[in-house]
Structures are given as structure tokens and as C-alpha cells.
């Protein structure tokens, strides 16, 4: 999906009002210095591309974050404010339902969410290019 035509300000507002708080809740009890950020992003479409991939793609040691509250709100924000996003996600959602597992908060998931926080912060930088 090409995130170039999203309403970035509306997505930013959604992040600031709710998604950021859900990320903090997920990370509660973890020191902010515990994980090194190893990925970043260049401009807003890039940030959303990486946020989408990191939130919804299973990775080694962290099978799925997709049912977490921050993930569901991220998905809703992208569906509302990125034209055509929902249509591209139908197949991905069906595949995800098939492999859904019991929610377990592993250290790897905490590290992944820490990376997500960094990507979202970068998305919200005032000087970041729209595209």
C-alpha cells in the first residue's frame, strides 16, 4: 500500500489522543532505555509503511501484536484516513485470523513495541516531510 495520500494530520491526532497511550500501557513496567531503537523512518509515508509492517507482520519471538489495543486503533486510523487502505488489508486479515494465537507478552514483543514507539515519534516530528 502507498501511504502517500493519507491524511497525516488526522492520523497524528489519533496517535496523540489514544494510540500513544495504549503503547505506553503495553510497555508499562519497562524502562525507556531498556531497548535500542534499530529502525527509523524518513518521511511520513515511510513511517506509516514501517509502522504498518511492524505492527501487523509476525516476527521471530513475537507472533502477533495485531489484537493489541494499539494495533486495532492503528488499523482503524489507517482505514479511515488512508484512501483504499481497507481494501488492501482484506486478504491479510483473513490470513491473520487463521494463525491467531493466545496473547503472550514476550520480551521480544516489548522490544518490538519499543521500536514502534520510536517510529511513531519520528512520524510526529514537526519537520518531517509529508512525502
Amino acid at each position: 500500500y502507498d501511504f502517500t495520500n493519507c491524511d497525516f494530520e488526522k492520523i497524528k491526532a489519533a496517535y496523540l489522543s489514544t494510540i500513544s497511550k495504549d503503547l505506553i500501557t503495553y510497555m508499562s513496567g519497562t524502562k525507556s532505555t531498556e531497548f535500542n531503537n534499530t529502525v527509523s523512518c524518513s518521511n511520513r509515508p515511510h513511517c506509516l509503511t514501517e509502522i504498518q509492517s511492524l505492527t501487523f507482520n509476525p516476527t521471530a519471538g513475537c507472533a502477533s501484536l495485531a489484537k493489541e489495543m494499539f494495533a486495532m486503533k492503528t488499523k482503524a486510523a489507517l482505514a479511515i484516513w488512508c484512501p483504499g487502505y481497507s481494501e488492501t488489508q482484506i486478504n491479510a486479515t483473513q490470513a491473520m485470523k487463521k494463525r491467531r494465537k493466545r496473547k503472550v507478552t514476550t520480551n521480544k514483543c516489548l522490544e518490538q513495541v519499543s521500536q514502534l514507539q520510536g517510529l511513531w515519534r519520528r512520524f510526529n516530528r514537526p519537520l518531517l516531510k509529508q512525502q
Epitope: 535500542n36 531503537n37 534499530t38 529502525v39 527509523s40 523512518c41 524518513s42 518521511n43 509515508p45 515511510h46 509503511t49 514501517e50 509492517s53 511492524l54 507482520n57 516476527t59 521471530a60 518490538q112 521500536q115 519537520l127 518531517l128 516531510k129
Partner: antibody, heavy 117, light 108 residues
Framework: QVQLQESGPGLVKPSETLSLTCTVS?????????WSWIRQPPGKGLEWIGY???????SYNPSLKSRVTISRDTSKNQFSLKLSSVTAADTAVYYC??????????WGQGTLVTVSS | EIVLTQSPATLSLSPGERATLSCRAS??????LAWYQQKPGQAPRLLIY???SRATGIPARFSGSGSGTDFTLTISSLEPEDFAVYYC??????????FGQGTKVEIK
């Protein structure tokens, strides 16, 4: 300390596919960062080709996108480059590098690929 | 595509002298700029990122400055091992990260 090592054929015929592999030691490619390919034609500057992130997102230089595929094999801690329909203009030293998806902090030593019949 | 123009193409200096290298972007890249050093037959090495932050293990004689379209890499006092080619790279314009054409710092 992370180390990267490129491998693959040094000579490729025009119109064929260039295939290179980067073997990473000292760091798991599924643990963090992105893993990138960059090339440098002899005596010229650097050109970014693309990356694959540790969680699988892939990004390509638009000027090469139609010909490039980057993939990974986490069991071998390797990532690979395929460049199709090569011409003499694709003759270059090809580097693999670790990236935070912005800049490149660790590089392989590079491998020269010549496109010639 | 953002074009980076480096100047001069070649800089002839003696050890101990100060080197000032320029990189100009065709449009603003904010502070999203890195500098690399490349010696003959070797891979590039990251020196500076975010326009002015030194990478791990880089000596303090290397410093970067600038924002927007004009950037400078300064080597305060050239050591013999500093004679090399230097490249700037912008990462403001994903997915079109670009490098400058390079500045060669040679022994006078």
C-alpha cells in the same frame, strides 16, 4: 561486532540475472535493523538499491524497482539480491550494509560484478 | 529526486591542515544527512549522521554542520589516514536515498 560478507558470481552475461548473497555474523538479521544493498560503478559514486528490515518490510530504489528482488534466509543469517535483465551499466562493486532504514553503519567489503558476454 | 552536489571535487592539502568539504542539496533535507569516508579498495565508513552527530568510534577532529540545503564536513587537522574520498548522503526523501558524487581529499 557485526560483520558482513558478500558472495556470488563475479561475471554475469547481459540480459541474465545477477544474484548475490550477504552473510552476516555477530548479529541476527531477525533481531533488528534493516539489511541493505548499495552499488558503486568503477570510479563512480554510490547508489542505494534497497533494504529488507528485520521484520520483513522491503523498500527499493524506484529507478531499479522493476528489476530488483531482495529476500532473506534467517536460518542462515543471510540476505540476498537479485537484479534481472542486467546490462553493462550494472557493472559495479556491490556492497551489503546494515541500516537503520536511513543511513548505513556497517558495510561488507564489496564484490565486483562485471556484466559482459 | 534530491540531488546532492559536493564541492570541491578535489581538495589538495597537507597533513595538519584544516579540510572543509561542502554538500549542497537541491531542496531542503532538514538535518537528514550523513557523511562517509572511503579509502581506495575499501567500503565506505559512516562518519556523521543527522548532519552533526559523530558515529561510534569516529575521532573528534571530524565534525558536521548545516541544515536545510547547505552542509559542511570539517576535518580540523588532517592526519595521514584521512586522505580519502568523502560522500554525503540524504535520507529525507524515501524511497530515493541519494549520495553526492564525492570529494577527494589528496595530499598536496
Amino acid at each position: 561486532q557485526v560483520q558482513l560478507q558478500e558472495s556470488g558470481p563475479g561475471l554475469v552475461k547481459p540480459s541474465e540475472t545477477l544474484s548475490l548473497t550477504c552473510t552476516v555474523s555477530g548479529y541476527s538479521i531477525s533481531s533488528g535493523y534493516g539489511w541493505s544493498w548499495i552499488r558503486q560503478p568503477p570510479g563512480k559514486g554510490l547508489e542505494w538499491i534497497g533494504y529488507i528490515s528485520y521484520y520483513g518490510s522491503i523498500s527499493y530504489n524506484p529507478s531499479l524497482k522493476s528489476r530488483v528482488t531482495i529476500s532473506r534466509d534467517t536460518s542462515k543469517n543471510q540476505f540476498s539480491l537479485k537484479l534481472s535483465s542486467v546490462t553493462a551499466a550494472d557493472t559495479a562493486v556491490y556492497y551489503c550494509a546494515r541500516t537503520n532504514l536511513l543511513y548505513f553503519d556497517s558495510w561488507g567489503q564489496g564484490t565486483l560484478v562485471t556484466v559482459s558476454s | 529526486e534530491i540531488v546532492l552536489t559536493q564541492s570541491p571535487a578535489t581538495l589538495s592539502l597537507s597533513p595538519g591542515e584544516r579540510a572543509t568539504l561542502s554538500c549542497r542539496a537541491s531542496q531542503s533535507v532538514s538535518n537528514n544527512l550523513a557523511w562517509y569516508q572511503q579509502k581506495p579498495g575499501q567500503a565506505p565508513r559512516l562518519l556523521i549522521y543527522d548532519a552533526s552527530s559523530r558515529a561510534t568510534g569516529i575521532p573528534a577532529r571530524f565534525s558536521g554542520s548545516g541544515s536545510g540545503t547547505d552542509f559542511t564536513l570539517t576535518i580540523s587537522s588532517l592526519e595521514p589516514e584521512d586522505f580519502a574520498v568523502y560522500y554525503c548522503q540524504q535520507y529525507s526523501d524515501w524511497p530515493q536515498y541519494t549520495f553526492g558524487q564525492g570529494t577527494k581529499v589528496e595530499i598536496k
